[in-house]
Interface confidence: low
C-alpha cells in the first residue's frame, strides 16, 4: 500500500473521523490538506486499497493571488446506506512531486440492531406432519441470539437457550404463526410473522370397493386434519391415455378430468357415467376450512365389461322354400365391451324354442328340414360380450309356410362348407 515518506512534513491538516452506525445510515468522511502550488487529486483508500468508484467530491480554495501560493484542498467521501461491506479503515492519499502521502486513518463501523438474512416464510403443512422453519440474523455487534415464538409465545425461556437457525416443528393440529426474535447488545429485532396453515393430510389407500360397467365405487382413508373437520373430498377421474401416460407424481392430468365431490363421512363415492371396459386414473383430495390436501397419486382403475345395452338392429327374416335367411346389423346402443358374437333363437307356434350361437357373423341360413307346416315362426337375436347377453330383439316373424308341409321345424343351420347343427 502507498506510504508517506518522512522526508517532508505531511500536507494533511485534517484526517478522516470515525463513523459507527446502523445499516442504512448515510455519513461523510472528510480530509483536508494544505499544499503549495497546483493542488493534487485526492484518492481514498479502504483497508489500503484505492477506491476506484468512490462517491467523493473535492473542493480547492487558493490562499493567495498567485498559482504558486498555498491551496486548501478538501475531499469528502459520501457513504450512502451503510452496509457491512463499507466497514473498515479509511485514509486519503495524494501524490506530491515524487512523494506519496497518506492521512491518518478513520474507521467506519457497523453496529446496531440485528439484521435478518433469512426469515420464516408462510407455508402450508399437512396436519401432524413435521417441518422446519429457518431464521438467520447477524450483527454487529455479535453475538446474535435467536428466540422463536409460536403464536406470540416464546418457545424457550431466554434468547440463546432454544433452537437457533432452524426450528423443527414435530407437527401442528391448528393453523399457527411463527416468528423469531434476534437479540444482540443493541436490542432486539423481530422477524416477519409466518403463517403456517394446517391442511388435511393426503388421503391414504384410495381403492376400489366395487366395479360396474359404468360406475366405480371407490373408498379411501382420510388423513388427519387437525382441529378442522373435513368439509368434503374431491375425486377426479380421467381417461387413461397410453399415449400421454399419467406419471405417479404428475401434478396435472393431460385432459380435463371428471370431478366429483363427496360429502364426508363416509369416505366413499360412487363415480358414475363412466365408459364400460375402459381404463381410468383416479385421485382424491380432501378439504377442510383451511384448504385442500394434496392429491393422492393417480391410481389406475378399470371399469369391467357390461352387456350390450340394445338388441341387434334391422333384423330381417325371409324364407325361400325350406330355407330361412336371417340377417341383422350390430346394435346401435353401446356394446359396453368387446362384441363376442350373437345368439339367435327361433320358435314356431307349437315347437320348442331353438337357441343358437352364431359367433360374429351377422347372417345365418336356417335349413328347415322336412316338409312340415309351421305357423307363426319367429326369430329373435341378441348380442353378447364377455359380461353376458344383451337384450333380445323383438320377435321377427317369418311369413307362414305353405299348407301341406307336415313335419315340424326341429333341425337347423346349414351354411356352405359348415356342418348342420341339429336339435333333438
Amino acid at each position: 500500500a502507498p506510504r508517506g515518506t518522512q522526508a517532508e512534513e505531511s500536507p494533511f491538516v485534517g484526517n478522516p473521523g470515525n463513523i459507527t452506525g446502523a445499516r442504512g445510515l448515510t455519513g461523510t468522511l472528510r480530509c483536508q490538506l494544505q499544499v503549495q502550488g497546483e493542488p493534487p487529486e485526492v484518492h481514498w483508500l479502504r483497508d489500503g486499497q484505492i477506491l476506484e468508484l468512490a462517491d467523493s467530491t473535492q473542493t480547492q480554495v487558493p490562499l493567495g493571488e498567485d498559482e504558486q501560493d498555498d491551496w486548501i484542498v478538501v475531499s469528502q467521501l459520501r457513504i450512502t446506506s451503510l452496509q457491512l461491506s463499507d466497514t473498515g479503515q479509511y485514509q486519503c492519499l495524494v501524490f506530491l512531486g515524487h512523494q506519496t502521502f497518506v492521512s491518518q486513518p478513520g474507521y467506519v463501523g457497523l453496529e446496531g440492531l440485528p439484521y435478518f438474512l433469512e426469515e420464516p416464510e408462510d407455508r402450508t403443512v399437512a396436519a401432524n406432519t413435521p417441518f422446519n422453519l429457518s431464521c438467520q440474523a447477524q450483527g454487529p455487534p455479535e453475538p446474535v441470539d435467536l428466540l422463536w415464538l409460536q403464536d406470540a409465545v416464546p418457545l424457550a425461556t431466554a434468547p440463546g437457550h432454544g433452537p437457533q437457525r432452524s426450528l423443527h416443528v414435530p407437527g401442528l393440529n391448528k393453523t399457527s404463526s411463527f416468528s423469531c426474535e434476534a437479540h444482540n447488545a443493541k436490542g432486539v429485532t423481530t422477524s416477519r410473522t409466518a403463517t403456517i396453515t394446517v391442511l388435511p393430510q393426503q388421503p391414504r389407500n384410495l381403492h376400489l370397493v366395487s366395479r360396474q360397467p359404468t360406475e366405480l365405487e371407490v373408498a379411501w382413508t382420510p388423513g388427519l386434519s387437525g382441529i378442522y373437520p373435513l368439509t368434503h373430498c374431491t375425486l377426479q377421474a380421467v381417461l387413461s391415455d397410453d399415449g400421454m401416460g399419467i406419471q405417479a407424481g404428475e401434478p396435472d392430468p393431460p385432459e380435463e378430468p371428471l370431478t366429483s365431490q363427496a360429502s364426508v363421512p363416509p369416505h366413499q363415492l360412487r363415480l358414475g357415467s363412466l365408459h364400460p371396459h375402459t381404463p381410468y386414473h383416479i385421485r382424491v383430495a380432501c378439504t377442510s376450512s383451511q384448504g385442500p390436501s394434496s392429491w393422492t397419486h393417480w391410481l389406475p382403475v378399470e371399469t369391467p365389461e357390461g352387456v350390450p345395452l340394445g338388441p341387434p338392429e334391422n333384423i330381417s327374416a325371409t324364407r325361400n322354400g325350406s330355407q330361412a335367411f336371417v340377417h341383422w346389423q350390430e346394435p346401435r346402443a353401446p356394446l359396453q365391451g368387446t362384441l363376442l358374437g350373437y345368439r339367435l333363437a327361433y320358435q314356431g307356434q307349437d315347437t320348442p324354442e331353438v337357441l343358437m350361437d352364431i359367433g360374429l357373423r351377422q347372417e345365418v341360413t336356417l335349413e328347415l328340414q322336412g316338409d312340415g307346416s309351421v305357423s307363426n315362426l319367429t326369430v329373435c337375436v341378441a348380442a353378447y360380450t364377455a359380461a353376458g347377453d344383451g337384450p333380445w330383439s323383438l320377435p321377427v316373424p317369418l311369413e307362414a309356410w305353405r299348407p301341406g308341409q307336415a313335419q315340424p321345424v326341429h333341425q337347423l343351420v346349414k351354411e356352405p362348407s359348415t356342418p348342420a347343427f341339429s336339435w333333438p
Epitope: 389407500n205 376400489l208 370397493v209 366395487s210 366395479r211 382413508t221 369391467p304 364377455a386
Partner: antibody, heavy 118, light 107 residues
Framework: DVQLQESGPDLVKPSQSLSLTCTVT?????????WHWIRQFPGNKLEWMGY???????NYNPSLKSRISITRDTSKNQFFLQLSSVTTEDTATYYC???????????WGQGTSVTVSS | DVQITQSPSYLAASPGETITIKCRAS??????LAWYQEKPGKTNKLLIY???TLHSGIPSRFSGSGSGTDFTLTISSLEPEDFAMYYC?????????FGGGTKLEIK
C-alpha cells in the same frame, strides 16, 4: 422370506370370544399390503373374514361385521382377530394371509384349528 | 355377494394328462379371479390372479383363462406334485368369495 403364523386356543366355549394372533416375520405390516383373516369350515368351504391395511384401516365381511374386530401391534409385527359371541358354527381352521389391493393373497399361514364346544 | 360355483368337485387324472377346472361367478367379476393350491401340511399357494396372470415361481404348465363370469384353470402335463385341492376366489369386490374347491386325485 415372508412367513405368517397363526396362534390361539384350540377350544372355545359357545358365547365366548375367539382371539387369534398372526405373527409376521420377514416383512413389516406397516410397510405395505393388507393383512387378512380367512377361515375354512369342515367340508372345505372358505370364507374371507376381513383385513387390516398397513395404514391401520380395516374392512370386514358384512356377514361378520357385528362380531369381528381386527387390530394390530406394530411393535411386535402382529395382527389379531377377535370374534365375539361364537357358536358351534364358528368351528373352523383359521388362516391369516396378506395381499395387495384387489390382488390375491400371496402368502398364507399354516392355519390353526379352532373348535367351539361346551 | 358374488357367488362362485366351482366344478367339478372331484377329479381323477393320471400324470401327464391335461385337466381343466371351471369357476362360474353369479355376476361379472371382470378378470379378477384367483386360483390357489392347497396341500396338507403346506401353506396355501397362489397360482394365478387376475384371471390369467401367473404368480411368480409358478410353473408354466398352470394357466388361467376367462373373464366376466366364466373362468378356467388348466394344468397341462400333470406332475405327481400337482395332485391337491384347488380353489378359485374372486377379488373383484369385497367381500371376497371362494369356490367350493376341486379335489384332484391320481387315477
Amino acid at each position: 422370506d415372508v412367513q405368517l403364523q397363526e396362534s390361539g386356543p384350540d377350544l372355545v366355549k359357545p358365547s365366548q370370544s375367539l382371539s387369534l394372533t398372526c405373527t409376521v416375520t420377514g416383512y413389516s405390516i406397516t410397510s405395505a399390503y393388507s393383512w387378512h383373516w380367512i377361515r375354512q369350515f369342515p367340508g372345505n368351504k372358505l370364507e374371507w373374514m376381513g383385513y387390516i391395511h398397513y395404514s391401520g384401516s380395516t374392512n370386514y365381511n358384512p356377514s361378520l361385521k357385528s362380531r369381528i374386530s381386527i387390530t394390530r401391534d406394530t411393535s411386535k409385527n402382529q395382527f389379531f382377530l377377535q370374534l365375539s359371541s361364537v357358536t358351534t358354527e364358528d368351528t373352523a381352521t383359521y388362516y391369516c394371509a396378506r395381499s395387495l389391493w384387489f390382488y390375491a393373497m400371496d402368502y398364507w399361514g399354516q392355519g390353526t384349528s379352532v373348535t367351539v364346544s361346551s | 355377494d358374488v357367488q362362485i360355483t366351482q366344478s367339478p368337485s372331484y377329479l381323477a387324472a393320471s400324470p401327464g394328462e391335461t385337466i381343466t377346472i371351471k369357476c362360474r361367478a353369479s355376476k361379472s367379476i371382470s378378470k379378477y379371479l384367483a386360483w390357489y393350491q392347497e396341500k396338507p401340511g403346506k401353506t396355501n399357494k397362489l397360482l394365478i390372479y387376475s384371471g390369467s396372470t401367473l404368480h411368480s415361481g409358478i410353473p408354466s404348465r398352470f394357466s388361467g383363462s376367462g373373464s366376466g363370469t366364466d373362468f378356467t384353470l388348466t394344468i397341462s402335463s400333470l406332475e405327481p406334485e400337482d395332485f391337491a385341492m384347488y380353489y378359485c376366489q374372486q377379488h373383484n369386490e369385497y367381500p371376497w368369495t371362494f369356490g367350493g374347491g376341486t379335489k384332484l386325485e391320481i387315477k
